[in-house]
């Protein structure tokens, strides 16, 4: 018998709902935020509901449009951005989606006090990047793979560089493994905090293996896509960094940073660079074996017009236990006197935490310790600190912002937010105005998402910015799901796990359980946030109970369970999922005959391994653009946490750990394989080495692609890709259409 | 009728300042920027800088930076030119016309109504 | 900064005559996005302010009469009277509206011959 979720007959419930894929897709139950966008200590923008960009004052209490909706219909501009001296505005329109964070755009520059498009020497399109300086209007942008800088909107431009080549040499903006796996941005220039300087990275990929696939398109003739795309083991971006000086950029030229000597005796990695002053910068580097990173802090020579990284000021980061850092090695926040700074790494217990770093690395200050990890620091002002961590009451899942007052000895500690929607808002993140007089926080759940302004000095809430209130009355008649966060404790190891329970859940009876997985290195899946999702509707109307576990290798939880997966990928983390399953089923209402698991990407080699680990526990599985062989992804990413596949290295687990050495053990389970034929991040070329394994060992299986799609398989394909996923999942289930 | 009428002449000492003020009437303020233009005898037309009175923001031009500022009270629909540290060549008559505000990229407007002009007379 | 020359400095024209000045601009003032010049032309009567006859290099302003024309493309501009009238005494400037800073030609005086 198939159970379903028995319906209450009283008249309240009768008026309610399940959910259907069609909300999911249509994005019926989606939350808004509210980030302001900061000009000033007092002062943001914000686009109104008209498309009208309105300055806001705080302290005034007044408002007033600074761009009219007509300005921005004009030339459908979709993004915008203000000049510092609030004289321009450029306009971004002809929006091209190239990567994860990269495209590029028309710009046009509106003259705020004329009230016109500034017309003499425009911009020329498409723009891969273009930013104001921090003061003034300077405009810096990269066209063609080349930065050219102005002086004033409607001043002739000034080339930087000449060397910039379409996937040859890149400048100001990153290469497709720097801006995937490295810098996680669209850009590779700097501002000085005056505009002074102007710092940019040059990546040249001339020996880097290209990655090629077709794009189909509409033509007779596919096109082919090339990429510069070092797979692990694969030769990598050369990277150098240069500063100019924008006020003379003709005088000297690009000058440029030297490498430290410890780092440029082998492959290495620029990782970061933050600006201290004017003629202080902060360079982070790390070798290609990602265990050793080196901060270093250089000054620029006014005699010799050059910059010194003397080696007194390079301070070094080093993993005993695994890589450096976390997902990325985290970046410094540099205090007034603009040398000592604060940072946050493993400290002496193996827990992430804020240090103060004054003079060595050695010697360094813990500002915050516990079993539990600092996250993100947002703002140092003269007295206080501002972070993010999951202290509060010991849920890994959770964020609150922190104050420490360092102003004081010794300094005080003060949960902002802990206990301001206690029940609504467990996972907290902040916006913050100049010397951050006031701040946002946006909550993102558990409850319905909220967005508030706070002043900084006291944390008063001064207004609510966004609350959702359309959302929480679209959803008074529908039955969401039950869900709860709560922990297993296996052989010494703490598996956090999100349930989500069909909203007439009963403990009595069985109900068919999903899995949905990532479980990559540093990531986070049982998390308190709100989301209305493909898997609520599975608990809300086809009665599946879906779980989300957090196992080795995931993060916030301290070097031991984070750096459990070094070196040896695709072993515990879906160990972790099996163990999770088991003790699931002990509860009591798991049908064990029915149990399946998916994931993407990551999650998609997690549930790949996991159907084919010959437990016999799932019936069914779905992967969505999985990786299969850690020899076919990016060498940043994979050689983070596998080292090289050579023989005097790691190449033993690399063979042992693809999805294709497992394919005679996909025989006794239902397999759905789905990809993007142009997914430029986890090649197709992953899914083809599966499909051709199962195929030479005679296993049926179910597969489906999605034409000209890339890794996130957007638009029409997303509702077909869960349509058909929804079906693939009943029929597992047995659940009728 | 569009008005722009100007304050009255003032004659004034090398080194002072001189603040002129242009009351408009008839027209929506906020939807023109506010010009100021001199002409000194027997010169030609020499534009000094205007202000949006939507936001404030005013543009000068570089030859007279940091010795004008240009200020709109729009409560009163009236825009004010100051201009210090005078010098003999300042002598000229300060003129405001108004400029339509172009909020598509294809517009730009000439300056179509002008007040009528203040002459102010710098001599020790 | 567009510099803007007019010539000739004078011009002295008989009523009911033609008056021909021209405007050249160091720079294109032409629009690319919409092909407009950004060029008008101004008519200055003793102790008055100046009145705005042509915008966009020829298109006249209302209630100007249609005796003033204007025409050019770039950076060469004419104004034209097509039959001089001696309310038409005065000095006439170009202006480019391009670019910033703005800029006036020196100005053109017309007389009755």
């Known amino acids: 018998i198939v159970l379903r979720p028995s319906r209450v007959h009283n008249s309240e419930e009768n008026t309610m709902r399940a959910l259907t894929l069609k909300d999911i897709l249509n994005g019926t139950f989606s939350y808004k935020t509210f980030f302001p966008n900061w000009i000033s200590g007092q002062e943001y923008l914000h686009q109104s509901a008209d498309n009208n960009i309105v300055l806001y004052n705080i302290e005034t209490g007044q408002s007033y449009t600074i761009l009219s909706n007509r300005t921005m219909k004009s030339v459908n501009a979709s993004n915008y951005g203000l000049s510092p001296d609030r004289q321009f505005v450029y306009l971004e329109s002809d929006y091209s989606k190239l990567w994860r964070y990269s495209y590029t755009a028309t710009y046009y520059i509106y003259d705020l006090s004329n009230g016109e498009f500034v017309r003499g020497n425009e911009l020329p399109r498409p723009i891969q990047y273009l930013c104001w300086s921090p003061v003034g209007s300077k405009l810096a942008y990269v066209y063609q793979n080349n930065i050219y800088l102005k002086q004033r909107p409607g001043d002739p431009p000034f080339q930087i560089t000449f060397n910039g080549r379409e996937n040859k040499i890149f400048n100001g903006i990153p290469d497709w493994v720097y801006e995937e796996e490295m810098l996680a941005t669209k850009y590779a220039l700097w501002w000085s905090p005056n505009g002074k300087f102007l710092a940019y990275a040059e990546f040249n990929d001339t020996d880097i293996p290209v990655i090629a696939y077709s794009y189909y398109g509409d033509e007779q003739y596919p096109r082919t896509i090339n990429i510069p795309y070092p797979k692990a083991g694969a030769k990598n971006p050369v990277v150098r960094i240069f500063i100019i000086d924008t006020t003379y950029p003709a005088y000297v030229g690009p000058q440029e940073v030297p490498v430290p000597a410890m780092i440029a005796s082998s492959d290495y990695y620029f990782s970061w660079l933050t600006w201290v002053t004017d003629e202080r910068v902060c360079l982070q580097w790390l070798k290609r074996v990602q265990n050793v990173s080196v901060l270093s802090i250089c000054d620029f020579r006014e005699d010799w017009q050059t910059w010194d990284c003397p080696k007194t000021q390079e301070h070094i980061e080093e993993s005993r236990t695994g890589w450096a850092g976390g997902f990325f090695v985290s970046t410094p926040v540099f205090s007034y006197d603009a040398i000592s700074y604060y940072k946050i790494f493993s400290d002496k217990d193996g827990y992430k935490h804020i240090h103060y770093i004054k003079d060595t690395v050695e010697n360094a200050i813990q500002i915050t310790s516990g079993k539990w990890e600092a996250i993100n620091i947002f703002r140092v002002t003269q007295d206080s600190l501002f972070y993010s961590s999951n202290e509060f009451e010991e849920y890994p899942g959770r964020r609150n912002i922190y104050r420490i007052s360092i102003g004081s000895y010794p300094p005080s500690k003060k949960c902002v937010t802990c206990h301001l929607r206690k029940e609504r808002c467990q996972y907290y993140t902040a916006s913050f105005s100049d010397y951050a007089k006031y701040y946002a926080l946006v909550c993102y759940g558990p409850g319905i998402p909220i967005s508030t302004l706070h002043d900084g000095r006291t944390d008063q809430e001064i207004k609510i910015l966004e609350e959702n209130k359309e959302l929480e009355n679209a959803l008074k008649n529908i039955q969401l799901p039950k869900e709860e966060i709560k922990k297993l404790e296996v052989d010494e190891i703490t598996l956090w796990y999100k349930m989500i329970l069909p909203p007439q859940f009963d403990r009595s009876k069985k109900y068919p359980l999903l899995i949905q997985v990532y479980g990559g290195p540093c990531s986070q899946s049982v998390r308190s946030v709100f989301a209305v999702n493909w898997i609520s509707y599975l608990a809300s109307k086809e009665g599946m109970v879906i779980a989300l576990v957090d196992g080795r290798g995931t993060a916030f939880q301290g070097d031991k369970l984070l750096y459990a997966v070094y070196r040896k990928l695709g072993v515990y983390e879906v160990e972790d999922q099996i163990t999770a399953v088991r003790k699931f089923i002990e509860m009591g209402f798991i049908d064990e005959k029915r149990i399946a698991i998916w994931g993407w990407s990551y999650g998609g080699y997690v549930s790949s391994l996991a159907l084919a680990s010959g437990t016999g526990l799932f019936k069914c599985g779905i992967a969505v653009a999985p990786v299969s062989s850690w020899e076919y992804y990016a060498s940043v990413y994979t050689e983070r946490f596998m080292g090289l596949p050579t023989k005097d290295d790691n190449l033993e687990h690399y063979k042992n750990s693809t999805v294709m050495a497992r394919a005679e053990y996909f025989r006794n389970v239902d397999y759905l394989l789905i990809h993007g034929t142009a997914d430029d991040n986890v090649h197709f070329q992953n899914s083809a080495q599966i499909a051709k394994a199962l195929v030479n060992a005679q296993v049926d299986f179910q597969a489906m692609w999605y034409s000209d799609q890339n890794h996130g398989l957007s638009g029409l394909s997303t509702n077909h890709l869960y349509t058909h996923m929804t079906h693939f999942l009943k029929q597992c289930f047995s659940l009728s259409d | 009728q569009v008005q722009l009428v100007q304050s009255g002449a003032e004659v004034k000492k090398p080194g002072a300042s001189v603040k002129v003020s242009c009351k408009t009437s008839?027209?929506?303020?906020?939807?023109?920027?506010i010009h100021w233009v001199r002409q000194a005898p027997g010169q030609r037309l020499e534009w000094i800088g205007g202000?949006?009175?939507?936001?404030?923001?005013?543009n000068y031009n570089q030859k007279f930076k940091g010795r004008v500022t240009i200020t709109v009270d729009t409560s009163a629909s009236t825009a004010y030119m100051e201009l210090s540290s005078l010098r003999s060549e300042d002598t000229a008559v300060y003129y405001c016309?108004?400029?339509?505000?172009?909020?598509?990229?294809?517009?730009?407007?000439?300056?179509?109504?002008w007040g009528q002009g203040t002459l102010v007379t710098v001599s020790s | 900064d567009i510099v803007m020359t007019q010539s000739p400095d004078s011009l002295a024209v008989s009523l009911g005559e033609r008056a021909t000045i021209n405007c050249k601009s160091s720079?294109?003032?032409?629009?690319?996005?919409?092909?407009?010049?950004?060029l008008a032309w101004y008519q200055q009567k003793p102790g008055q302010p100046p009145k705005l006859l042509i915008f966009?290099?020829?298109t006249r302003e209302s209630g100007v009469p249609d005796r003033f024309s204007g025409s050019g493309f770039g950076t060469d501009f004419t104004l034209t009277i097509s039959s001089l009238q001696a309310e038409d005494v005065a000095v006439y400037y170009c202006?480019?509206?391009?670019?910033?800073?703005?800029?006036f030609g020196q100005g053109t005086k017309v007389e009755i011959k």
């Open positions: 016309a108004r400029r339509r505000i172009a909020y598509g990229y294809d517009e730009g407007h000439a300056m179509d109504y």
């Open positions: 008839r027209y929506t303020f906020t939807e023109y920027t």
């Open positions: 202000i949006n009175p939507n936001n404030g923001i005013p």
């Open positions: 720079q294109s003032l032409v629009y690319s996005r919409n092909q407009k010049n950004y």
């Open positions: 966009w290099a020829s």
């Open positions: 202006q480019q509206y391009f670019s910033y800073p703005l800029t």
